[in-house]
């Protein structure tokens, strides 16, 4: 998988007027890195782990750069012609990434009230737009507001290009975040369901990477996909990864179920514990 | 004594049917999740079906999906094997086998029938 | 779907030596493998299950190890009864069994 570093960026209107505040949200390898979400923005770390990859520093220069890019998203909102009474969103998504063999993307995508309308490749300058007469619209208006200003068009692209994968670079360089692997807490706990059924949930969690296999098994064999429930795979805000899958068994079988679970090649079961008492499985010996 | 017995093999032409049964004694059928396991003349065990104990999981091999069916009787202690569209090299000894329950297993089969033997001729 | 091959296909060995059965999993398999017997016109027995815990009832000469891709079944010292014919399942996902490795008389 690639490094990446998204920006998220919206700004609002309502009845027209483009509100003052904006949010910014970016992800660092997937994972909540730096979030603006007042008047004023202030960049602040989401957890220790980006604390840890941003070192003693202020963020007066992330904060900079995110109070510049949302003054000009809420530019571009203001030009937007399609504005209706009540709340409206434009969203802009920047994302860059570095790969294995060093090779870089970059891309820039705009969405109206969460429909997406306008995408670019930052390195190849190349415009797209979905077929829909409404995204075509919006897309020519934010496309003519953009060519307005010649210098905005060939040298903030560029830079924001470029930019984006220099501050990932940086960050890479802080070496918190290069290819670690974290193994997963794994517990399970049970449940009572109904007419002798109880419910077993198996939970992983303060995992990385994100890629994780988590099944139930009934003396060794997996259950059919169909007989468990699977929760997604979430950030849990600490720069890792939390999940779960559960399913159905008859009270008094418990000894028969375990939890397999398998990442980044080590591998664990995890039994149904006997009682009602919530049984925490450590880290793999 | 814990035993698993076969019946229902014989002699079908091609893109015939054949229903397999196995009848469980000694243990309670109810609670064990059971395959069915082939093995054609001269030739290796060939695993062909897997049900669980609430039949919520069934699984089959590729060389027989869409052609067979396993399906159980708890209360008449039997699993069954309903086998269609039939060709030559279903030509086999069919043995039901029990996964055994033990703790820490892996999907090992404890306890075998003794197998019936299937001919499809064409 | 897991491809189970077993090595040698067949072997000949006397009373008393130490045989060695391999069995390689196309994929990692943890340890989600068992090992059967089979004699002539009988049905398998189960010698192993989860790669190394005996089967209660089997004798202690008998013994697996492998995790991962690759397994071992071994013999420490062959009896006049252990001329049969031997196989590993996994169960990693679904099932399947290995091709088997007959083991007769030198």
């Known amino acids: 998988e690639p490094h990446s570093l998204r920006y998220n960026l919206t700004v609002l209107s309502w009845d027209g007027s483009v509100q003052s505040g904006f949010l910014t949200e970016v992800h660092l390898d997937g994972q909540p890195f730096l979030r603006c979400d007042r008047q004023k923005c202030r960049a602040k770390p989401q957890g220790q782990w980006a604390e840890d990859v941003l070192g003693n520093k202020t963020w007066d220069r992330e904060t900079r750069d995110l109070t510049g890019n949302g003054k000009d998203l809420r530019m571009t909102l203001a030009h937007i012609k399609d504005q209706k009474e009540g709340l409206h969103s434009l969203q802009e998504i920047r994302v860059c990434e570095i790969h294995e063999d060093n090779s870089t993307r970059s891309s820039q995508h705009f969405y109206y009230d969460g429909e997406l309308f306008l995408s670019q490749n930052l390195e190849t300058k190349e415009w797209t737009m979905p077929q829909s007469s409404r995204a075509q619209t919006l897309a020519m208006n934010v496309r003519n507001f953009l060519k307005e200003d010649a210098m905005k068009t060939k040298t903030h692209y560029h830079a924001m290009h470029a930019d984006c994968l220099q501050e990932l670079r940086r960050y890479l360089k802080s070496g918190v975040v290069l290819r670690r692997t974290v193994p997963p807490m794994v517990n399970v706990t049970r449940s009572e369901a109904s007419e002798g059924n109880i419910t077993v949930t198996c939970r992983a969690s303060g995992f990385y990477p994100w890629n994780i296999t988590l099944s139930w098994r009934q003396d060794g064999v997996s259950l059919s996909h169909d007989t468990q429930q699977w929760g997604d795979v979430l950030p849990d805000g600490n720069g890792t990864y939390q999940t779960w899958v559960a399913t159905r068994i008859c009270q008094g079988e418990e000894q028969r179920f375990t939890c397999y679970m398998e990442h980044s090649g080590n591998h664990s079961t995890h039994p149904v514990p006997s009682g009602k008492v919530l049984v925490l499985q450590s880290h793999w010996q | 004594e814990v035993q698993l017995v076969e019946s229902g093999g014989g002699l079908v032409q091609s893109g015939g049917s054949l229903r397999l049964s196995c009848v469980a004694s000694g243990f309670t059928l109810s609670r064990y999740s059971m395959n069915w396991v082939r093995q054609a003349p001269g030739k290796g065990l060939e695993w062909i079906s897997y049900?669980?104990?609430?039949?919520?999981?069934?699984y089959y091999a590729d060389s027989v999906k869409g052609r067979f069916t396993i399906s159980r009787d708890n209360a008449k202690k039997s699993l069954y094997l309903q086998m269609n569209s039939l060709r030559d090299e279903d030509t086999a000894v069919y043995y039901c086998a029990r996964v055994s329950d033990i703790t820490g297993n892996t999907g090992a089969f404890d306890i075998w029938g003794q197998g019936t033997m299937v001919t499809v001729s064409s | 779907d897991i491809q189970m091959t077993q090595s040698p296909s067949s072997l000949s060995a006397s009373v008393g030596d130490r045989v060695t059965i391999t069995c390689r999993a196309s994929q990692s398999i943890s340890s989600y493998l068992n090992w059967y017997q089979q004699k002539p016109g009988k049905a398998p027995k189960l010698l192993i299950y989860?790669?190394?815990s005996l089967q209660s009832g089997v004798p202690s000469r008998f013994s697996g190890s492998g995790s991962g891709t690759d397994f071992t079944l071994t013999i420490s010292s062959l009896q006049p009864e252990d001329f049969a014919t031997y196989y590993c399942?996994?169960?990693?996902?679904?099932?399947?069994f290995g091709g088997g490795t007959k083991v007769d008389i030198k």
């Open positions: 399942q996994q169960s990693y996902s679904t099932l399947t």
């Open positions: 049900i669980n104990s609430r039949s919520n999981t069934i």
């Open positions: 989860a790669a190394s």
